[in-house]
Amino acid sequence: TTPEPCELDDEDFRCVCNFSEPQPDWSEAFQCVSAVEVEIHAGGLNLEPFLKRVDADADPRQYADTVKALRVRRLTVGAAQVPAQLLVGALRVLAYSRLKELTLEDLKITGTMPPLPLEATGLALSSLRLRNVSWATGRSWLAELQQWLKPGLKVLSIAQAHSPAFSCEQVRAFPALTSLDLSDNPGLGERGLMAALCPHKFPAIQNLALRNTGMETPTGVCAALAAAGVQPHSLDLSHNSLRATVNPSAPRCMWSSALNSLNLSFAGLEQVPKGLPAKLRVLDLSCNRLNRAPQPDELPEVDNLTLDGNPFLVPGTALPHEGSMNSGVVPAC
């Protein structure tokens, strides 16, 4: 016997559906109606036939009471080919729900998203996460998607993007966005970062994550941030192959004084990079290739320094910097 496609835990909290059959019984998903966190994986299916069965232009207000009864706060949809019209229909209906977090992963969005009708209500998400989502509309996808969302989005994560750069002139500002995560876009690079950080469209960013994004030097990232007017409090550049030296011809970049936490772990560094901010609360240099303890003049003024997992550190070595947070044990790097 084939396993049930949907499983609801005994607390009505988590419901997971894996539709792997060529013609799945979508009604199985109804057992998820009382779950708080729902994951639906469509097994790579093309959802085009759905358009024939649903009226994408129907007034979603007719479903408002039904949708309001859903407990779902967090929804993950993955592994499908989705017509943009169907995605929009779903967003319009979900605007009446309690949904706060939406994750889309391994999706191919086909066709163009229609403009938001005047009477339509946007979806009041606090968090939107996209991983390996391709859009037929290329660079304008964020602007098209944005119009279907209310302006209160706080967290935006875009990984494995086919087009990580946006059509900046079409994108509206994200006034409430405090966390932007562009990690796992290895082809992004510092030029791509400049293109992705649309100037003055992310005025409230506090946390910027750029893990595994092809960044080359902290100074190059500094320049991209300065150009975009982005002033994060926390910056994660871990898991990039960073160069410690700066191109002598490159102009010196002044870091924003707002930056107080910098993660440079797993960056292949053999020495402390030049051009770091002068003062930081937290600096993570763990799991690099530092062969000697950094000298005080190489480091910023820092309250909390992590150097674990570097070759120069063996158990019992004196702490190389006042206020450092080394365990004395080399972690699995």
Epitope: E11, D12, F13, V33, R71, R73, R74, S127
Partner: antibody
Framework: QLQLQESGPGLVKPSETLSLTCTVS?????????WNWIRQPPGKGLEWIGY???????SYNPSLKSRVTISRDTSKNQFSLKLSSVTAADTAVYYC????????WGQGTLVTVSS | DIQLTQSPSSLSASVGDRVTITCRAS??????????LHWYQQKPGKAPKLLIY???NLQSGVPSRFSGSGSRTDFTLTISSLQPEDVATYYC?????????FGQGTKLEIK
């Protein structure tokens, strides 16, 4: 058998940050459910503070949201509460609890806010 | 926020009595076929203990003299035959919608 154990200082000064940790044994905080903090001022009723779910998603009581952070350390199977700018009104027994029907509770820890 | 109002706030009954506590919600706590209303017992100095979940389901290990009923906004906890060890404060709680809220409690004493 699932067990939850709260730990942290029993006395916090006004305006400081209250920090508590819940250590979970007999179950994984990253495999299922919601992991909550609930408090009870002396002689009063119960108040839900917020949760962190198996996925890392958080939900907070709006009455405390501006002061609360719930985080987790999956490697230690622990989740934590930070409540900033505390006053005497935050004096309470703090419980860590699993699920949204609260079937598993820690024994609770009394935190007194006083100078 | 959904407000839960319990009545009575306190009550005194004799051993063997049938005891009823009610909980009224300011709006429905139902999601489709389920009522997300739960009942707890708390003894002094102890953590609360789940008695009834989803309005009418008896939690494992709880004596069968405890039962729950109701839907949408009106719910009842019944103790069919009061025992001395049932002296405690009883709380209702909803998990249909965050913030998850509790009733103010009903203190039960033995006459």
């Amino acid at each position: 058998q699932l067990q939850l154990q709260e730990s942290g200082p029993g006395l916090v000064k006004p305006s400081e940050t209250l920090s508590l940790t819940c250590t979970v044994s007999g179950g994984s905080i990253s495999s299922d459910s919601a992991w909550n903090w609930i408090r009870q001022p002396p002689g009063k009723g119960l108040e839900w503070i917020g949760y962190i779910s198996y996925s890392g998603s958080t939900s907070y009581n709006p009455s405390l949201k501006s002061r609360v952070t719930i985080s987790r350390d999956t490697s230690k199977n622990q989740f934590s509460l930070k409540l900033s700018s505390v006053t005497a009104a935050d004096t309470a027994v703090y419980y860590c609890v699993r699920g949204l029907r609260f079937a598993y509770w820690g024994q609770g820890t009394l935190v007194t806010v006083s100078s | 926020d959904i407000q839960l109002t319990q009545s009575p706030s306190s009550l005194s009954a004799s051993v063997g009595d049938r005891v009823t506590i009610t909980c009224r919600a300011s709006e429905s706590v139902d999601s489709y076929v389920n009522s997300f209303l739960h009942w707890y017992q708390q003894k002094p100095g102890k953590a609360p203990k789940l008695l009834i979940y989803r309005a009418s389901n008896l939690q494992s290990g709880v004596p069968s003299r405890f039962s729950g009923s109701g839907s949408r906004t009106d719910f009842t906890l019944t103790i069919s035959s009061l025992q001395p060890e049932d002296v405690a404060t009883y709380y209702c709680q909803q998990s249909n919608e965050d913030p998850y809220t509790f009733g103010q409690g009903t203190k039960l004493e033995i006459k």
